[in-house]
């Protein structure tokens, strides 16, 4: 039995910071879990990961290239990424694994979320000299 996950298909970011919510068809408070966020079509890079259960709030840790934190309630894990750059634009996949108690459960691969980080253009206004 695979768990289903819902993600927003697209997030356009112009503030260098984004919150991505992963909504699961399973009660997160029922078991001990490992929630992670992966970057890339083949989920090559583990961006952020947190372990949690019903008795403690998870500690999220990030890949060296990213800054992340997270939070969860009974059906949603929310990853917050900041200091994002244009080259972080990519598709991101939510993953969850329920380890304890058995049986092991994980989610069906979702369609992912394209996070598009907009380039910041600095506007230099031509100032007229005072007469």
């Amino acid at each position: 039995n695979k768990i289903l996950v819902k993600q927003s298909p697209l997030l356009v970011v112009d503030s260098n910071e984004v919150s991505l919510s992963c909504r699961y068809s399973y009660n997160l408070l029922a078991k001990e879990f490992r929630a992670s966020l992966y970057k890339g079509v083949n989920s090559d890079v583990e961006v952020c990961v947190g372990n949690g259960n019903f008795t403690y709030q998870p500690q999220f840790r990030s890949n060296a290239e990213f800054n992340c934190d997270g939070d969860f309630d009974n059906e949603t894990v929310t990853f917050r990424l900041w200091n994002l750059h244009v080259n972080h634009t990519d598709i991101y996949f939510c993953k969850i694994e329920f380890m304890y108690p058995p049986p092991y459960l994980d989610n069906e691969r979702s369609n992912g979320t394209i996070i598009h980080i907009k380039e910041k253009h600095l506007c230099h206004t031509q100032s007229s000299p005072k007469l």
Partner: antibody, heavy 120, light 111 residues
């Protein structure tokens, strides 16, 4: 037929590191449904769980060893590894790898074990 | 961590005897009606061998003289009629929570 074969044991200096291998056959380490744990047994003592790796590559470790241990695998060789650092005399033990299925997490297949002796 | 306490630590018995070993967990190891408590047999110089899984299910190939019972925190391994090959050390193990833990073992010796 499922088989697990450990190797890499021997005499190690205190403060040194060990890297043990567990070659699996009869099942794939990267296919869903099974994971593998490392378990050790000091001479004349009971069994101590070290940690585990799931088919996904996710790992869990014993809190008492977490800072010194890494479990990894090479899917192309269907082999599991245990790296243990900063070795001390009390790490002297027979090290086993054992497979578990995802329904109950009982250890249904075990390797023969490999002895690691930490001594100067 | 969940502590598992086995009793007795050792026992002497004769061939044909009925032997009972108990395992007590520091908290319940039940989830959705399943007890995540398993029993292993270990002979000197050998790896442990799974006997009973999920408290009462007999592992394939294990003789029917071995049985397990219990739920929650109290579990029992019974050997109905001890055979010469049964002299060994027996361990219980829980997989309800990480870290997985084992009992300290019960050594069954010849009287």
């Amino acid at each position: 037929e499922v088989q697990l074969v450990e190797s890499g044991g021997g005499l190690v200096q205190p403060g040194g590191s060990l890297r043990l291998s567990c070659a699996a056959s009869g099942f794939s380490l990267s296919t869903g449904g099974v994971g593998v744990s490392w378990i050790r047994q000091a001479p004349g003592k009971g069994l101590e769980w070290i940690g585990e790796i799931y088919h996904s590559g996710s790992t869990y470790y014993s809190p008492s060893l977490k800072s010194r241990v890494t479990i990894s695998r090479d899917n192309s060789k269907n082999t599991l590894y245990l790296q243990l650092n900063s070795l001390r005399a009390e790490d002297t033990a027979v090290y086993y790898c054992a497979r578990y299925e995802y329904d109950y997490y009982d250890f249904d297949y075990w390797g023969q074990g490999t002895l690691v002796t930490v001594s100067s | 961590d969940i502590q598992l306490t086995q009793s007795p630590s050792s026992l002497s018995a004769s061939v044909g005897d009925r032997v009972t070993i108990t395992c007590r967990a520091s908290q319940s190891v039940d989830f959705h009606g399943i007890s995540f408590l398993h029993w292993y047999q270990q002979k000197p110089g050998k790896a442990p061998k799974l006997l009973i899984y999920a408290a009462s299910s007999l592992q394939s190939g294990v003789p029917s003289r071995f049985s397990g019972s219990g739920s929650g925190t109290d579990f029992t391994l019974t050997i109905s009629s001890l055979q010469p090959e049964d002299f060994a050390t027996y361990y219980c193990q829980q997989s309800y929570r990480s870290p997985r833990t084992f009992g300290q073992g019960t050594k069954v010796e010849i009287k």
